[in-house]
């Protein structure tokens, strides 16, 4: 088992909004849960966009999940990762 490296980034979207992207890379096996939480609970699937789980060329995999949020409310969002029985949460950088 190779645990993922998780990285959260933000980019400007429409006025007053930002897109936050959570990327998991260099993990094996390929089964992974990567999702956004808002206010500590699951963010509905229809407000998230997932990338495919793809090989990254080193025998490991990568994927991502993104959502759009209001600027100033970053604290309310965390990216949740679960892989091979391990869990971690990752805040939006300020």
């Amino acid at each position: 088992t190779v645990p993922p490296m998780v990285n959260v980034t933000r980019s400007e979207a429409s006025e007053g909004n930002i897109t936050v992207t959570c990327r998991a890379s260099s993990f094996y096996p390929r089964n992974i849960i990567l999702t956004w939480r808002q206010d500590g609970v699951s963010l509905s699937a229809d407000t998230q966009q997932w990338g495919d789980v793809l090989p990254d060329g080193n025998g490991t995999y990568q994927t991502w999940v993104a959502t759009r949020i209001c600027r100033g409310e970053e604290q309310r969002f965390t990216c949740y990762m679960e892989h091979s029985g391990n869990h971690s949460t990752h805040p939006v950088p300020s």
Epitope: R37, G40, S42, Q75, Y80, H87
Partner: antibody, heavy 119, light 107 residues
Framework: DVQLQESGPGLVKPSQSLSLTCTVT?????????WNWIRQFPRNKLEWMGY???????NYNPSLKSRISITRDTSKNQFFLQLISVTTEDTATYYC????????????WGQGTLVTVSA | DIQMTQSPASLSASVGETVTITCRAS??????LAWYQQKQGKSPQLLVY???MLADGVPSRFSASGSGTQYSLKINSLQPEDFGSYYC?????????FGAGTKVEIK
């Protein structure tokens, strides 16, 4: 360490309002987290009532939405529960707690305060 | 709302025994589950979060597992301080709800 302490009257008459205070020490309620009220009925059933978060946003249990209000006094680092039109069914031990945004579980609770609704 | 059904409602066990408590959600909660222990007259204390993760200071004789709608809490070699009530709680969506509890008593 975050510490929470509930206070308020232990006896309320039916149809009146129940008002409780949670005093938080060790952490500013405006810094982060969701600050919650949870109650436990005499037969031990637990019910999440709602929260006010670090920015003042509230979220209530729909079963209570028409009767509940959670407010705060940031200068005193306190948050409050008001429940209107109480009945004997609101007799319970009331706890304040908080959760971080990595997940809505409750790492620490106040010691609880028993409120009896009776004429 | 997601309903949480705990079983058994109560159990009697001896010190040193292994006990298992189960919690069933009315819908898939995707491991968004916590377990608490409550002693008589005290506040609940967090034992487990994210379905399987032990909270700080929780002894390793406690373990938790599950997925989807079915979850369990196992106590190996029950100790005198383990007697009390245990509650599950989901945090998949609002409103947050708790199981009705399992009372673990001394046989």
């Amino acid at each position: 360490d975050v510490q929470l302490q509930e206070s308020g009257p232990g006896l309320v008459k039916p149809s009146q309002s129940l008002s409780l205070t949670c005093t938080v020490t060790g952490y500013s309620i405006t810094s982060d987290y969701a600050w919650n009220w949870i109650r436990q009925f005499p037969r031990n059933k637990l019910e999440w009532m709602g929260y006010i978060n670090y920015s003042g946003t509230t979220n209530y249990n729909p079963s209570l939405k028409s009767r509940i209000s959670i407010t705060r006094d940031t200068s005193k680092n306190q948050f409050f529960l008001q429940l209107i039109s109480v009945t004997t069914e609101d007799t319970a031990t009331y706890y304040c707690s908080y959760y971080r945004y990595d997940g809505a579980w409750f790492p620490y609770w106040g010691q609880g305060t028993l409120v009896t609704v009776s004429a | 709302d997601i309903q949480m059904t705990q079983s058994p409602a109560s159990l009697s066990a001896s010190v040193g025994e292994t006990v298992t408590i189960t919690c069933r959600a009315s819908g898939n909660i995707h491991n968004y589950l916590a377990w608490y222990q409550q002693k008589q007259g005290k506040s609940p204390q967090l034992l487990v979060y994210n379905a399987i993760m032990l909270a700080d200071g929780v002894p390793s004789r406690f373990s938790a597992s599950g997925s989807g709608t079915q979850y369990s809490l196992k106590i190996n070699s029950l100790q005198p301080e383990d007697f009390g009530s245990y509650y599950c709680q989901h945090f998949w969506s609002f409103p947050l709800t708790f199981g009705a509890g399992t009372k673990v008593e001394i046989k």
